[in-house]
């Protein structure tokens, strides 16, 4: 007869490991008992379990409640056992020693490999601002056994660097993604992809990029100067800019306070029926946590009774 087992049994942390040991005997041969022991190098054999044809299953106190026989029906020549809820410390060498009649004793060894799937974490880098040089966008760390693979999935142009730390029973891998921030990256996904033999599918953690910037400001509403005449209703100026975080707007008049009746509504300055009083230099001040911009325009309200038009100046300042 001969023993049938596996060289390596691989199981994911927390799952049950079947340790196979089957005696392929000749007709009439019987298995009296199967002794399972852990036999790591440099240490004596440690009892796991004893399967006896008459006495049944004896489990070592160290493995009490964790070792069982596979569910029925059972072949009397099958000395396999189930190790419940495998933990990392279970990883190692195991031996089954089979006592048969009349052929004598046989033994075989196998290695139990316990895969520890990683639980990845993604940490965003410092705040990204347009105009910075190469900056850390995010780092992704995953620890497992064996060492996981950490890569990045993104449309954003950047560079990656990885480092690994070996522990006694696992390895931690950290990958960093660096980029030169630009406003076009705003809202773009940056995904950390972790691969590991203990995972059914890759684990993905997505971070949305936020790049602080503030565009130049400009004012719209004075495109047709002839519309700005005494008595006109619904005249308005709109301040144009964009930024991250979204900017706030403030209107002032350079040559005095805002005339009465003029309404400020965020980026819009609304006028009552126009009078010559409304002529002046208006300043739109745009700001966010990153920067601030100004744009100023000169409003000249025309008197329709006058023939000659006035020149309108548009000045933008930062």
């Amino acid at each position: 007869g001969e023993l049938e087992t596996s060289d390596v049994v691989t199981v994911v942390l927390g799952q049950d490991a079947k340790l196979p040991c089957f005696y392929r005997g000749d007709s009439g041969e019987q298995v009296g008992q199967v002794a399972w022991a852990r036999v790591d190098a440099g240490e004596g054999a440690q009892e796991l379990a004893l399967l006896h044809s008459k006495y049944g299953l004896h489990v070592s106190p160290a493995y009490e409640g964790r070792v069982e026989q596979p569910p029925p029906p059972r072949n009397p020549l099958d000395g396999s056992v189930l190790l419940r809820n495998a933990v990392q410390a279970d990883e190692g060498e195991y031996e089954c020693r089979v006592s048969t009649f009349p052929a004598g004793s046989f033994q075989a060894r196998l290695r139990l490999r316990v895969l520890v799937p990683p639980l990845p974490s993604l940490n965003p880098g410092p705040a990204l601002e347009e105009g910075q040089g190469l900056t850390l966008a995010a780092s992704c760390t995953a620890e497992g056994s064996p060492a996981p693979s950490v890569t990045w999935d993104t449309e954003v142009k950047g560079t990656t660097s990885s480092r690994s730390f070996k522990h006694s029973r696992s390895a931690a891998v950290t990958s960093e993604f660096h980029l030169v921030p630009s406003r076009s990256m705003n809202g773009q996904p940056l995904t950390c992809v972790v691969s590991h033999p203990g995972l059914l599918q890759d684990q993905r953690i997505t971070h949305i990029l936020h790049v602080s910037f503030l565009a130049e400001a400009s004012v719209r509403g004075l495109e047709d100067q002839n519309l700005w005449h005494i008595g006109r209703e619904g005249a308005m100026l709109k301040c144009l800019s964009e930024g991250q975080p979204p900017p706030s707007y403030n209107w002032t008049r350079l040559d005095g306070p805002l005339p009465s009746g003029v309404r400020v509504d965020g980026d819009t300055l609304g006028f009552p029926p126009l009078t010559t009083e409304h002529s002046g230099i208006y300043v739109c001040h745009v700001s966010n946590e990153f920067s601030s911009r100004d744009s100023q325009v000169t409003v000249d309200v025309l008197d329709p009774q006058e023939d000659s038009g006035k020149q309108v100046d548009l000045v933008s300042a930062s």
Epitope: Q33, A37, H52, K54, H58
Partner: antibody, heavy 123, light 107 residues
Framework: EVQLVESGGGLVQPGGSLRLSCAAS????????MSWVRQAPGKGLEWVSG????????YYADSVKGRFTISRDNSKNTLYLQMNSLRAEDTAVYYC????????????????WGQGTLVTVSS | DIQMTQSPSSLSASVGDRVTITCRAS??????LAWYQQKPGKAPKLLIY???SLQSGVPSRFSGSGSGTDFTLTISSLQPEDFATYYC?????????FGQGTKVEIK
Amino acid sequence: EVQLVESGGGLVQPGGSLRLSCAASGFTFGTYGMSWVRQAPGKGLEWVSGIKPGDSTTYYADSVKGRFTISRDNSKNTLYLQMNSLRAEDTAVYYCARAELLAFDVYTASDYWGQGTLVTVSS
Amino acid sequence: DIQMTQSPSSLSASVGDRVTITCRASQGISSYLAWYQQKPGKAPKLLIYAASSLQSGVPSRFSGSGSGTDFTLTISSLQPEDFATYYCQQHYTTPPTFGQGTKVEIK
């Protein structure tokens, strides 16, 4: 024929010592686990101590730990129990018994027993 | 330590009666259970090992059953020589422990 014969029992004062012997024959003594089991007058059976074949690892009941010592001489096919600091509650018939080692520290039932030797601890 | 609880502690029966003695372990012991018979002034005698296996030379009227925590010794037809005290013993762990015994007396 398997035989186990105990000797060495007798009357001893509290605090005294006694050495019991168990002579084995009819089987390969060195390959069996051996144990001592006692029975106080009118009481049930109580396991006292055991010794493994091979490396002679020893085991004791809490009630005798530190006072009793089990040993074996495989060349003489003899099991011993050295009893020190004896107490009145150690009064009992002491039996030696054999059991086959299956594996590790797992044994069969004790299939052969000696006839016993009486130990009386009294002043 | 594993506690072994035997019941009843004593019983009276007549020759030819069917007698059942039970033994319960405080935790699972698979089939690492033996039954012994002891007569006054004599050493215990192994009747049943591995919960249900009959020791060589023991009459077939003795039988054992059970596994795990609950075990039974049955004497199918009590004979005069069967009046004695019966003990169960677990040898799953060290220390091996005995039940308190069941005395079978003549009715």
